[in-house]
């Protein structure tokens, strides 16, 4: 019969012959022959291969270097790589997570819209009218101005996006 020019899924062509690929978590030891199946071997400790493959070497698991502020979020297996994340207060610079960035704080006049995670930074928003933030914080939302009326007081000093209103006693001399 004619030698194949293409092979089925999970196979590869070698020496005019279709051989089975090694399954995830295993590496190629020797190609199949007319008489033998493809020979595969499991990846060693701290190694992985995440696809059907014909690799002769497994990939090393990623090292989450604590010197870079990294820690293991998910331990690797023979079929998956280790996933790193950053220590508390920091987030990954990129999807690859090879280094970390300090979470930013929201300046006075801005509040936290979304708290940072291991993979995303703090998202800040300007405090709208009626709200304020007088601190630089990675957690604090904009706070509503104090309602003087509910305390039977009057506004003595208007609030801003950075300061609360100042309440004072009602003027007793009203006619």
């Amino acid at each position: 019969p004619e030698p194949p020019t293409a092979c089925r899924e999970k196979q590869y062509l070698i020496n005019s012959q279709c051989c089975s690929l090694c399954q995830p978590g295993q590496k190629l030891v020797s190609d199949c022959t007319e008489f033998t199946e493809t020979e595969c071997l499991p990846c060693g400790e701290s190694e992985f291969l995440d696809t059907w493959n014909r690799e002769t070497h497994c990939h090393q698991h990623k090292y989450c270097d604590p010197n870079l502020g990294l820690r293991v979020q998910q331990k690797g297996t023979s079929e998956t790589d280790t996933i790193c994340t950053c220590e508390e207060g920091w987030h990954c610079t990129s999807e690859a997570c090879e280094s970390c960035v300090l979470h930013r704080s929201c300046s006075p006049g801005f509040g936290v819209k979304q708290i940072a995670t291991g993979v995303s930074d703090t998202i800040c928003e300007p405090c709208p009218v009626g709200f304020f933030s007088n601190v630089s914080s990675a957690f604090e939302k904009c706070h509503p101005w104090t309602s003087c009326e509910t305390k039977d007081l009057v506004v003595q000093q208007a609030g801003t996006n950075k300061t609360d209103v100042v309440c004072g006693p009602q003027d007793r001399l009203r006619a």
Epitope: D65, G69, G89, T93, A96, E98, S99, V101, L102, S105
Partner: antibody, heavy 116, light 112 residues
Framework: EVQLVQSGAEVKKPGSSVKVSCKAS????????MHWVRQAPGQGLEWMGY????????NYNQKFKDRVTLTADKSTSTAYMELSSLRSEDTAVYYC?????????WGQGTTVTVSS | DIVMTQSPLSLPVTPGEPASISCRSS???????????LYWYLQKPGQSPQLLIY???TLASGVPDRFSGSGSGTDFTLKISRVEAEDVGVYYC?????????FGQGTKLEIK
């Protein structure tokens, strides 16, 4: 080998702008933030802000917020710092520095002189 | 902003003698994650700064072990056990606990 190579010295007039480049090589550009630090003559170090080349997200020192623009070009692995409305006090050496576990690599510095 | 204050600002030292530089922060640099975000850099004459110590006490790669860093949340010390001629320059402490990142004024070490 990691290298950060900055553009050459600049002489600018007050009120104008300057754009300094920092070309990175020897590592994956998008995996580390690039910070900018300046040093006025005979003075100490002052942090200006950083750009995350992966997200193009900048974070500025409020002192420079309205005058500085940090950008990054992934295709050429180059970071840029543009400072506008220059005044004589902006005369300084401007450094780019990569943040790994610290400022582990620095550019050679770019001298910007602001003079009428 | 966190203020970093160094002392002394000038430090003449005889080669072979020890040297000590102090750095104080206006706020504790000890994070709730257990790390202290204090860094030491040396800027040799005519050069860019270079890292000496990170996270208060960890020696950077390639830095001689005559350098050491120690401290608490707000008071930090850089020690050189035996000063050599190549150690001359300006030493800076820096905090990376929060933005903006801030540096000390610098301590100029010179050989007597």
């Amino acid at each position: 080998e990691v290298q950060l190579v900055q553009s050459g010295a600049e002489v600018k007039k007050p009120g104008s702008s300057v754009k300094v480049s920092c070309k990175a090589s020897g590592y994956t550009f998008t995996s580390y933030t690039m910070h900018w630090v300046r040093q006025a003559p005979g003075q100490g170090l002052e942090w200006m802000g950083y750009i995350n080349p992966s997200s193009d997200y900048p974070n500025y020192n409020q002192k420079f917020k309205d005058r500085v623009t940090l950008t990054a070009d992934k295709s050429t692995s180059t970071a840029y710092m543009e400072l506008s409305s220059l005044r004589s006090e902006d005369t300084a050496v401007y450094y780019c520095a990569r943040w790994g576990y610290s400022f582990d690599y620095w550019g050679q510095g770019t001298t910007v002189t602001v003079s009428s | 902003d966190i203020v970093m204050t160094q002392s002394p600002l000038s430090l003449p030292v005889t080669p072979g003698e020890p040297a000590s530089i102090s750095c104080r922060s206006s706020k504790s640099l000890l994070h709730s994650n257990g790390n202290t975000y204090l860094y030491w850099y040396l800027q040799k004459p005519g050069q860019s700064p270079q890292l000496l110590i990170y996270r208060m006490s960890t020696l950077a790669s390639g830095v001689p072990d005559r350098f050491s860093g120690s401290g608490s949340g707000t008071d930090f010390t850089l020690k050189i056990s035996r000063v050599e001629a190549e150690d001359v320059g300006v030493y800076y402490c820096m905090q990376h606990l929060e933005y903006p990142l801030t540096f000390g004024q610098g301590t100029k070490l010179e050989i007597k």
